[in-house]
């Protein structure tokens, strides 16, 4: 049910990368507006983004108080400048999300290479610990924080002269790995959750090479 | 449920090309890794390469480099393996693999059934 | 590469024995090694994963434990079902090595 001059909304989406999380869907408003509400499975509604001709929601604020819990969330259409209008039932039009676990589906955002270091034949190299929009005690957390050794990152490297992509595993954000002398490797790390079912891997780092500037070597 | 399959083995001249398909059902190949692995007859296993199916990394054996290339198609959920040049000492059972991680630990849980590939003339 | 050693090559073993497989690796691997049964005609299947990690639906008869660069797969009894050759892999670094395998007959 609902007014005769209002479409419920559908395709309702979560859009999340590293919790940073938007709720979107359709169609384009004409002549109504939207209201989003969230909650987990056992809170209250908590009303977002009011009236808005908008077809997305910011909902990061909501779902990063706690990352473990599954949140559903669903959008009101209200026809526009009568917002106090509702439908036959007594409600106004409303379609809900799909539920949403930010731990378990957020996706694993593009990584970055902060520096690497050749000492010898050996090389370590470094992944910047992202900061997430999670806080705890009004500070904000590293995705290193939050998914602590449930994250992994995953090494690809190879010699600048070839192709084949030798693999390495760390579940800090630190690889050391034996590298022939002489030759120069290119680098680039992917994250993982291997304890996931969906969304396990992250878009691989840009590339890094040895004899660029983010790169040290040391002769020993 | 988890399987592959294997297919496109069969009795090749030397020199001569085939192509290996290994069909997953029950997972996505992207959010995994998969191994091909082989195993001349009555002798051991022997690691043939890797695709990392989700950016298309590969890496293969000394004795395999430059002559097999492996593949994955995702809308497919299909890896495959393409042998060229081939030798009579590529002749066995080729088995595809998937791969997982524990912590940063790997293992391969899922294996194919096997398909042989005779190079004979 | 690194190199795995498996002793012995073969063994004959009753049931109700208690049969032991070792792994030496020629270099540090951590615990990234793994161990696989495989019976005539048919694919390996995983038994033991991180060295110690027995494999969902494997018998709790199997264990697998490391020293430093040495690898153990333990049959605390041996079953007819457990005639087969046992291989271990380590995945430490790339390329993934296999040993020789281990071919587990009937006495």
């Known amino acids: 049910s609902g007014t005769t001059n209002t479409v419920a909304a559908y395709n309702l989406t979560w859009k999340s990368t590293n919790f940073k999380t938007i709720l979107e869907w359709e169609p384009k408003p004409v002549n109504q507006v939207y209201t989003v509400q969230i909650s987990t499975k056992s809170g209250d509604w908590k009303s977002k983004c009011f009236y808005t001709t908008d077809t997305e929601c910011d909902l990061t604020d909501e779902i990063v108080k706690d990352v473990k819990q599954t949140y559903l969330a669903r959008v009101f259409s209200y026809p526009a400048g009568n917002v106090e209008s509702t439908g036959s039932a007594g409600e106004p039009l409303y379609e809900n999300s799909p539920e949403f676990t930010p731990y378990l589906e957020t996706n694993l955002g593009q990584p970055t290479i902060q520096s690497f270091e050749q000492v010898g034949t050996k090389v370590n190299v470094t992944v910047e610990d992202e900061r997430t929009l999670v806080r705890r005690n009004n500070t904000f957390l590293s995705l290193r924080d939050v998914f602590g050794k449930d994250l992994i990152y995953t090494l690809y490297y190879w010699k600048s002269s070839s192709s084949g992509k030798k693999t390495a595993k760390t579940n800090t954000n630190e690889f050391l790995i034996d590298v022939d002398k002489g030759e120069n490797y290119c680098f680039s790390v992917q994250a993982v959750i291997p304890s996931r079912t969906v969304n396990r891997k992250s878009t691989d780092s840009p590339v890094e090479c040895m004899g660029q500037e983010k790169g040290e070597f040391r002769e020993i | 449920e988890v399987q592959l399959v294997e297919s496109g083995g069969g009795l090749v001249q030397p020199g001569g090309s085939l192509r290996l398909s290994c069909a997953a059902s029950?997972?996505?190949?992207?959010?995994?890794?998969i191994h091909w692995v082989r195993q001349a007859p009555g002798k051991g296993l022997e690691w043939v390469g890797y695709?990392?199916?989700?950016?298309?990394?590969?890496y293969y054996a000394d004795s395999v480099k430059g002559r097999f290339t492996i593949s994955a198609d995702t809308s497919k959920n299909a890896a495959y393996l393409q042998m060229n040049s081939l030798r009579a000492e590529d002749t066995a059972v080729y088995y595809c693999?998937?791969?997982?991680?524990?912590?940063?630990?790997?293992?391969?849980?899922?294996w194919g059934q096997g398909t042989l590939v005779t190079v004979s003339s | 590469d690194i190199q795995m050693t498996q002793s012995p090559s073969s063994l004959s073993a009753s049931v109700g024995d208690r049969v032991t497989i070792t792994c030496r690796a020629s270099?540090?691997?951590?615990?990234?090694v793994a161990w696989y049964q495989q019976k005539p005609g048919k694919a390996p299947k995983l038994l033991i994963y991180?060295?110690?990690f027995l494999y969902s639906g494997v018998p709790s008869r199997f264990s697998g434990s490391r020293s430093g660069t040495d690898f153990t797969l333990t049959i605390s009894s041996l079953q007819p079902e457990d005639f087969a050759t046992y291989y271990c892999?380590?995945?430490?670094?790339?390329?993934?090595?296999f040993g020789q395998g281990t071919k587990v007959e009937i006495k």
């Open positions: 693999a998937r791969a997982d991680y524990f912590y940063i630990d790997e293992y391969w849980d899922y």
């Open positions: 029950g997972f996505t190949i992207s959010g995994y890794w």
């Open positions: 695709i990392d199916p989700y950016n298309g990394a590969t």
């Open positions: 270099q540090d691997v951590n615990t990234a």
């Open positions: 991180s060295a110690s």
């Open positions: 892999q380590q995945h430490y670094t790339t390329p993934p090595t």
